[in-house]
């Protein structure tokens, strides 16, 4: 019968001829009366056999990631008779792995959106690298993830690639962050190969800023001939938030005379001071009113940012009109 051990050949061997092992018949007494032949894909080009001894050699550099095993056939013939000594047999040559592939992030580019002020531990995104080396061969494809850029705001779980928030962030200070993640094979041991990826993390707005008046004091004038409903001027607050979180409502906080009103222009986010009652210069020609401004939408959990509405004082001077 045939005698052989399992055949392995390391990939990427640079030698011109690498001895893999020996194929022989147990009838072979070593007197060179038998001839060994190799058949199948790779026979003669990738692998050769010593016809007399049955020794098998790899004569080409192999790449496991291209092809990890070869199935060949062996024959042994009695030279004298030309007859097969053993039935033709199939055997396998396995290409063994070396760590010749770095981890690669295949789903690039990575982008994630997370609300500003999210608590520590909030999951942002998971990045995954793949390594073409053999996962069953030692640590060649066992990866560890680490953060090269992004501290102190982000952290990455070493074995999963899950990125989490490690420090609260304020969109109004910085609205996006570039995080660089490294994946290293060999679980970080010497000889490890690595790959990196960038993750763009954008902060979405939450309503953590209340509107604040641009001026603590405004001065407006109104003619005593102005009819009720007249717009006598505008006031304006600013809000560092954006979109719906910056929508505001103006109102009167204090007007003993009940002469004025404030309406909100929701397109410009300005407050428009309106004459509610006609004024009479001879009766009163100086008014003072206090206005306040609040956000339109404030979720309950964000109310802590909206205690005490911003206020402004408006001095209104009545202009005299000569009466007939």
């Amino acid at each position: 019968g045939w005698v052989w051990n399992q055949f392995f050949v390391p990939e990427e061997m640079n030698t011109t001829s690498h001895h893999i092992g020996q194929l022989r018949s147990d009838l072979d007494n070593g007197n060179n009366s038998f001839q060994y032949k190799l058949l199948g894909a790779g026979a003669g080009s990738t692998f050769i056999i010593d016809e007399r001894t049955g020794d098998i050699y790899a004569i080409q550099k192999l790449d496991r990631e291209e092809r990890s095993l070869y199935i060949l056939r062996a024959q042994v013939i009695d030279i004298a008779t030309g007859r097969a000594v053993e039935p033709e047999s199939e055997f396998v040559i396995k290409v063994s792995d070396i760590n010749d592939n770095e981890p690669k992030f295949l789903d690039e580019p990575y982008e994630a959106i997370v609300p500003e002020m999210s608590p520590e531990g909030t999951l942002v995104i998971q990045v995954t690298a793949s390594d073409a080396d053999d996962p069953s061969s030692g640590n060649n494809a066992r990866l560890l993830y680490s953060l090269l850029q992004g501290q102190p705001y982000f952290s990455v779980e070493p074995t999963t690639g899950v990125i989490r928030i490690s420090s609260k962030m304020d969109r109004e200070l910085q609205d996006e962050y570039w995080v660089i993640i490294q994946a290293k094979d060999m679980i970080g041991q010497p000889g490890a190969l690595s790959g990196t990826t960038s993750v763009l993390i954008k902060l979405s707005d939450v309503n953590d800023n209340k509107p604040i008046f641009k001026e603590s004091l405004y001065r407006l004038t109104v003619s005593e001939s102005a009819p009720t409903g007249t717009s006598i001027g505008t006031i304006m607050a600013y809000d560092n938030d954006i979109g719906e979180n910056a929508e505001m409502d103006y109102s009167i906080e204090e007007d003993d005379s009940q002469t004025f009103d404030i309406i909100t222009n929701h397109e410009t986010q300005e407050g428009i001071v309106i004459l509610k009652k006609k004024v009479d210069f001879e009766h009163q020609n100086h008014y003072g009113i206090r206005a306040k401004v609040k956000n339109h939408h404030v979720p309950e959990q964000l109310m802590k940012y909206h205690t005490e509405a911003s206020t402004t004082f408006i001095k209104i001077q009545v202009e005299d009109v000569d009466e007939p």
Epitope: Y218, Q284, N285, H286, G288, K315
Partner: antibody, heavy 120, light 107 residues
Framework: QVQLQESGPGLVKPSQTLSLTCTVS??????????WSWIRQHPGKGLEWIGY???????YYNPSLKSRVTISVDTSKNQFSLKLSSVTAADTAVYYC????????????WGQGTLVTVSS | EIVLTQSPGTLSLSPGERATLSCRAS???????LAWYQQKPGQAPRLLIY???SRATGIPDRFSGSGSGTDFTLTISRLEPEDFTVYYC????????FGPGTKVDIK
Amino acid sequence: QVQLQESGPGLVKPSQTLSLTCTVSGGSISSSGYYWSWIRQHPGKGLEWIGYIYYTGSAYYNPSLKSRVTISVDTSKNQFSLKLSSVTAADTAVYYCARDGSSGWYFQYWGQGTLVTVSS
Amino acid sequence: EIVLTQSPGTLSLSPGERATLSCRASRNISSSYLAWYQQKPGQAPRLLIYGPSSRATGIPDRFSGSGSGTDFTLTISRLEPEDFTVYYCQQYGSSFTFGPGTKVDIK
């Protein structure tokens, strides 16, 4: 802290024009919403508001003095001025400049006052 | 114009006593448009109260203001030696007018 300082002649002849200047320091006369007033106090008597000006030049005067009073402003010098024409002995008084408040038309800041005597 | 009348003209009290000064307007004024000042000899008036019960910056809490309509009051809860001087009320709704003053002197 806003400070105001009056300056001008302490003696004016009858029928002439009294001229005083108020220099503002520690704040801009162009601050939005503030009015700059002149107020006087006859010797041993009460206070009388003369008029005010806004940094834009808009002025408003006490109706009883309106025909004789002009208040002007010079934002580049951070000053405002009072001119009172055709003075008589009844215009002898301590003249104060003042700025109104951030929550109303009351007088929050005052100069120390300057005595102007009308006499020949 | 709105005329302000202050009473009494002179108030004689001892240190530690409570002083109640009155200011009456010739017609209704909104309470938001009245102020009180203190004036010491040779000095400019100093704002005490505005609107009519808000204390100006740096004013001790023994000074308080109240009132509405035509009747307003300045109260000094416990007179200190430096409080013996002249007090004026002022309205700032219809132009600007001052009361004639109340002198608080030591009994």
